[in-house]
């Protein structure tokens, strides 16, 4: 089941998926001046079985000005965006896929890829949040969001992250400790069945992830 909405947006923060659940779609978008090759895939799809997951289809772009098919070259990382106006300054360094059955890694860039990556997430997907460059976490509770099915509708849980500018008059008495994952606040809808998957990554991962996997600018 696809999630209806984008993950929540938090001022001066960005989110990143560490891995993508089977069923996730990534649009094949080309940068300006390029287009998908004729009969090329509209999207990549994370598929697999119990032991292995991978992206079906390959995105291919060709110049809008020529009718040549695109050259197959080793893709180079380039700026990406993730279903919102947050720019990806460096490619994601995925966690070991073996530890996340039923999930795909970040797909490698393709030649002449658009600067925006548009993902269509599925129920059970988890994304992690971090303050962008120039901001730091004033408060970090559970800094992730999960797409859940509630009352037949999908919704994202709310990440608890407040980012403040480094120049603002905040007081930071001590450096943040890695955040353990508590049970969280009851949601207003919890009177009925909530279905989600058993996908759980240690929340410590969110607190200790390399900054390079997150965006470094967001305005």
């Amino acid at each position: 089941e696809l999630c209806d909405d984008d993950p929540p947006e938090i001022p001066h923060a960005t989110f990143k998926a560490m891995a993508y659940k089977e069923g996730t779609m990534l649009n094949c978008e080309c940068k300006r001046g390029f287009r998908r090759i004729k009969s090329g895939s509209l999207y990549m799809l994370c598929t697999g079985n119990s032991s292995h997951s991978s992206w079906d289809n390959q995105c291919q772009c060709t110049s809008s000005a020529t009718r040549n098919t695109t050259k197959q070259v080793t893709p180079q990382p380039e700026e990406q965006k993730e279903r919102k106006t947050t720019e990806m300054q460096s490619p994601m360094q995925p966690v070991d896929q073996a530890s996340l059955p039923g999930h795909c890694r970040e797909p490698p860039p393709w030649e002449n890829e658009a600067t925006e990556r548009i993902y269509h997430f599925v129920v059970g997907q988890m994304v992690y949040y971090q303050c962008v460059q120039g901001y730091r976490a004033l408060h970090r509770g559970p800094a992730e969001s999960v797409c859940k099915m509630t009352h037949g509708k999908t919704r994202w849980t709310q990440p608890q992250l407040i980012c403040t500018g480094e120049m603002e008059t905040s007081q930071f008495p001590g450096e943040e400790k890695p955040q353990a994952s508590p049970e969280g606040r009851p949601e207003s809808e919890t009177s009925c069945l909530v279905t989600t998957t058993d996908f759980q990554i240690q929340t410590e991962m969110a607190a200790t992830m390399e900054t390079s996997i997150f965006t470094t600018e967001y305005q």
Epitope: E9, P11, L138, H139, R140, Q158, Q160, E176, P182, E183
Partner: antibody, heavy 118, light 107 residues
Framework: EVQLVQSGAEVKKPGATVKISCKVS????????MHWVQQAPGKGLEWMGV????????NYNQKFKGRVTITADTSTDTAYMELSSLRSEDTAVYYC???????????WGQGTLVTVSS | DIQMTQSPSSLSASVGDRVTITCKAS??????LSWFQQKPGKAPKTLIY???RLVDGVPSRFSGSGSGQDYTLTISSLQPEDMATYYC?????????FGQGTKLEIK
């Protein structure tokens, strides 16, 4: 059920200090930051500051010129707001409110009236 | 600090009327704007967040719109229970700042 229960009304003299408590129940205290908001009689809302209940980080509205101090006691799931050097214009209702991801104030305390009078 | 200019400061309307309240920020606040309703003697209640997203349980007659510096709260068909004071809040930057409020009365 989520509840934020504030301490009772206070009457203070100018120059004194008031400390209001906000006791939380129904959720994990350290997950959610706590804000404090002032509302003078017949006036609008003024954000005073916020504390991370997780790590004690704070951010204050400079309008209060260093007179406000927000603290949190994780052993009792209670947040506190202390306002010093009170003056008559500090007569107001003070609210605690939690910050919930996409929007800052989803749960509020019932409010505490502080009257500053000589 | 970001200034929030809310207008009108008060208005009177009839049941069934369409009512509009506006808020203008002194700079772009990236749609990080909430609308609150406050009734006398009560704590404020969030109606809208992120400029246009309705909080669960809030009647659909309430809607929000806008981007950049200019935002609007609309009540499509005014009900007697909507008599209250309404505030906008920007939460893009610290310090968070509220509009001055709009007192809505029923004719």
């Amino acid at each position: 059920e989520v509840q934020l229960v504030q301490s009772g009304a206070e009457v203070k003299k100018p120059g004194a200090t008031v400390k209001i408590s906000c006791k939380v129940s129904g959720y994990t205290f350290t997950d959610y930051a706590m804000h404090w908001v002032q509302q003078a009689p017949g006036k609008g809302l003024e954000w005073m500051g916020v504390i991370s209940t997780y790590n004690g980080n704070t951010n204050y509205n400079q309008k209060f010129k260093g007179r406000v101090t927000i603290t949190a006691d994780t052993s009792t799931d209670t947040a506190y707001m202390e306002l010093s050097s009170l003056r008559s214009e500090d007569t107001a209702v003070y609210y605690c409110a939690t910050s919930y991801g996409n929007y800052p104030f989803d749960y509020w305390g019932q409010g505490t009236l502080v009257t500053v009078s000589s | 600090d970001i200034q929030m200019t809310q207008s009108p400061s008060s208005l009177s309307a009839s049941v069934g009327d369409r009512v509009t309240i506006t808020c203008k920020a002194s700079q772009d606040i990236n749609s990080y704007l909430s609308w609150f309703q406050q009734k006398p003697g009560k704590a404020p209640k969030t109606l809208i967040y992120r400029a246009n997203r309705l909080v669960d349980g809030v009647p659909s007659r309430f809607s929000g719109s806008g981007s950049g510096q200019d935002y609007t709260l609309t009540i499509s068909s005014l009900q007697p229970e909507d008599m209250a004071t309404y505030y906008c809040l920007q939460y893009d930057e610290f310090p968070y700042t509220f509009g001055q409020g709009t007192k809505l009365e029923i004719k």
